[in-house]
């Protein structure tokens, strides 16, 4: 029953932390825990990397062009994120709410 | 070619109320995020309060934070600043500020001058 | 908070000679090997103008003789070689965590 509520609560507010809170000013700490998330499993976006674009930061200008964070790139380097492309972007099906459904169900059964 | 121009400032007494304008153009305005910068008469700059591109997410430091409300209108392509509960420590001159790309405020207003006193 | 130190409060040099300015934060303002911090000048009765972001980028229409450098919490600005329209107060400022806060500025004058 914890761990059902746990990935409930995960998938609803993954996606809004993404998309309101990543990259704002005050929020630090939530954008280093998902740029941390992204690059430690691999993966882009709560269910892809297509979430990125209802993100306040990324349709802003302040992105620089980006479509995803550079957090999601294989390779780090400054603007990565103005790619979107497998080559380049983790591409995982199911986005980091997978990654970490994985990884909670290891860890806490 | 950017262009932010300021209005509302005056002179107001400690605890009163002023509401400033800041009229953007040139520049796609529901794209941008917004800032407002004042500085002191001592030079000093300070960040006051930010607002997201879409309005979402705002941001005010705490001797500003219960006091001042940012707020943006996209479709008129206006940024506001309402100050209540004026201190003499907020007379400064308020300038309406935004990035271009990645970090750094390129674009800034005139400045609209903010004087608090009995 | 980020507290930002400047040295020194104001300088004056001739004509050609090397302006540089220091900016010390009281935190790291670096993230994902980006170092946060800009540089501003302003002419008396002017805003503040953007001359170097993240820390070493010139921002366009910025003279050549304007360059920053640093990381982590150690920032200069260097300008060489300095010219009469130079004159003004220099600040830095950092958006590595809000609030984001600027320097104390240096005035630069000319001998």
């Known amino acids: 029953a914890y761990y059902q509520q746990l990935n409930t609560e995960l998938k609803e507010n993954l996606k809004d932390t993404m998309t309101k809170r990543y990259h704002q000013p005050g929020h630090e700490a939530v954008t280093s825990a998902v740029d941390q998330l992204q690059q430690e499993f691999h993966c882009c976006g709560s269910n892809n990397s297509q979430d990125w674009r209802d993100s306040e930061w990324i349709r802003s200008q302040e992105a620089g062009g980006r479509v995803v964070p550079d957090s999601c790139c294989k390779t780090v380097v400054a603007l990565c994120g103005q790619r979107d492309h497998a080559s380049n972007i983790y591409k995982v099906e199911g986005g980091c709410i997978t990654k970490l459904e994985t990884f909670i169900q290891e860890h806490l059964r | 070619e950017v262009k932010l121009v300021e209005s509302g400032g005056d002179l107001v007494q400690p605890g009163g109320s002023l509401k400033l304008s800041c009229a953007a153009s040139g520049f796609t305005f529901s794209t941008y995020t917004m800032s407002w910068v004042r500085q002191t008469p001592e030079k000093r700059l300070e960040w006051v309060a930010y607002i997201s591109s879409g309005g979402v997410t705002t941001y005010y430091p705490d001797t500003i934070k219960g006091r001042f409300t940012i707020s943006r209108d996209n479709a008129k392509n206006t940024l506001f600043l309402q100050m209540n509960s004026l201190k003499s420590e907020d007379t400064a001159m308020y300038y309406c500020?935004?990035?271009?790309?990645?970090?750094?405020?390129?674009?800034w207003g005139q400045g609209t001058l903010v004087t608090v006193s009995a | 908070d980020i507290v930002l130190t400047q040295s020194p409060a104001s300088l004056a040099l001739s004509l050609g000679q090397r302006a540089t300015i220091s900016c010390r934060a009281s935190a790291s303002v670096d993230y994902y090997g980006t170092s946060l911090m800009q540089w501003y000048q302003q002419k008396p009765g002017q805003p503040p103008k953007l001359l170097i972001y993240?820390?070493?980028n010139v921002e366009s229409g910025v003279p050549a003789r304007f360059s920053g450098s640093g990381s982590g919490t150690d920032f200069s600005l260097n300008i060489h070689p300095v010219e009469e329209d130079d004159l003004a107060i220099y600040f830095c400022?950092?958006?590595?965590?809000?609030?984001?806060?600027f320097g104390g500025g240096t005035k630069l004058e000319i001998k």
């Open positions: 993240e820390a070493s």
């Open positions: 500020t935004s990035p271009r790309t990645g970090t750094g405020f390129a674009y």
């Open positions: 400022q950092q958006s590595r965590k809000a609030p984001y806060t």
